[in-house]
């Protein structure tokens, strides 16, 4: 999906209003310095691409974040403010249902959510030059 036509300001407002708080809740008990940010993004569409990938694609050591509250809200925000996003996700959702596993918060998942926090922060500051 090409995130170029999303309403970035609305997605930013949704993040600041509620998604950010859910990410903090997920990470509660973890020091903010515990993980290094290794994933970066260069502009808002790129940030949303990386956010979608890290939130919804299973990775080794972190089978699924998709049922976490921050993920459900992220999916909803993209569905509302990215035209056509919902339609592109129907097949992906059906595939995900088949391989759904029970929720387990592993250290790898905590690291992944820490990366997500960094991507969201970057998304909210689009005019900053890449380090």
């Amino acid at each position: 999906y090409d995130f170029t036509n999303c309403d970035f300001e609305k997605i930013k407002a949704a993040y600041l209003s509620t998604i950010s708080k859910d990410l903090i809740t997920y990470m509660s008990g973890t020091k903010s310095t515990e993980f290094n940010n290794t994933v970066s993004c260069s502009n808002r569409p790129h940030c949303l691409t990386e956010i979608q990938s890290l939130t919804f694609n299973p990775t080794a050591g972190c089978a699924s974040l998709a049922k976490e509250m921050f993920a459900m809200k992220t999916k909803a925000a993209l569905a509302i403010w990215c035209p056509g996003y919902s339609e592109t996700q129907i097949n992906a959702t059906q595939a995900m249902k088949k391989r759904r596993k029970r929720k387990v918060t592993t250290n790898k998942c905590l690291e992944q959510v820490s990366q997500l926090q960094g991507l969201w922060r970057r998304f909210n500051r689009p005019l900053l030059k890449q380090q």
Partner: nanobody
């Protein structure tokens, strides 16, 4: 241009009722979501209720569930908030607000409808005072 005009506020005794109206003009009403917010003196603006004009889906704040009812008359481009069993705590300025994408994505909007930062257009407000 897009305009929202509220009416129906006033002074009422505890236990009484009021019906607020939000008349909209200047946009395709059917595609929009309309929400009611309220703000009491010294407090933050809070979401009261939401309706999708495309499918009629409605959401309510816990504090008004069972007492307030939101409805929409698409022919008149007007949204109503019927407020029953009013309490002194309901005293506030009431505002209606419109947003252009949540109206056609009402199921996904359950997470976001109550956040004022997401709305593009606002009315000037109507005052509701509930005396004990």
């Amino acid at each position: 241009q897009l305009q929202l005009v509220e009416s129906g506020g006033g002074l009422v005794q505890a236990g009484g009722s009021l019906r607020l109206s939000c008349a909209a003009s200047g946009f395709n009403f059917d595609d929009y979501a309309i929400a009611w917010f309220r703000q009491a003196p010294g407090k933050e603006r809070e979401g009261v209720s939401f309706i999708s004009n495309s499918d009629g889906t409605a959401y309510y704040a816990d504090s008004v569930k069972g007492r307030f009812t939101i409805s929409s008359d698409n022919a008149k481009n007007t949204v109503y908030l019927q407020m029953d069993s009013l309490k002194p705590d309901d005293t506030a300025d009431y505002y209606c607000a419109a947003e252009g994408r949540m109206g056609t994505h009402s199921r996904d909007s359950v997470y976001f409808w109550s956040f004022s930062a997401l709305y593009d257009y606002w009315g000037q407000g109507t005052q509701v005072t509930v005396s004990s």
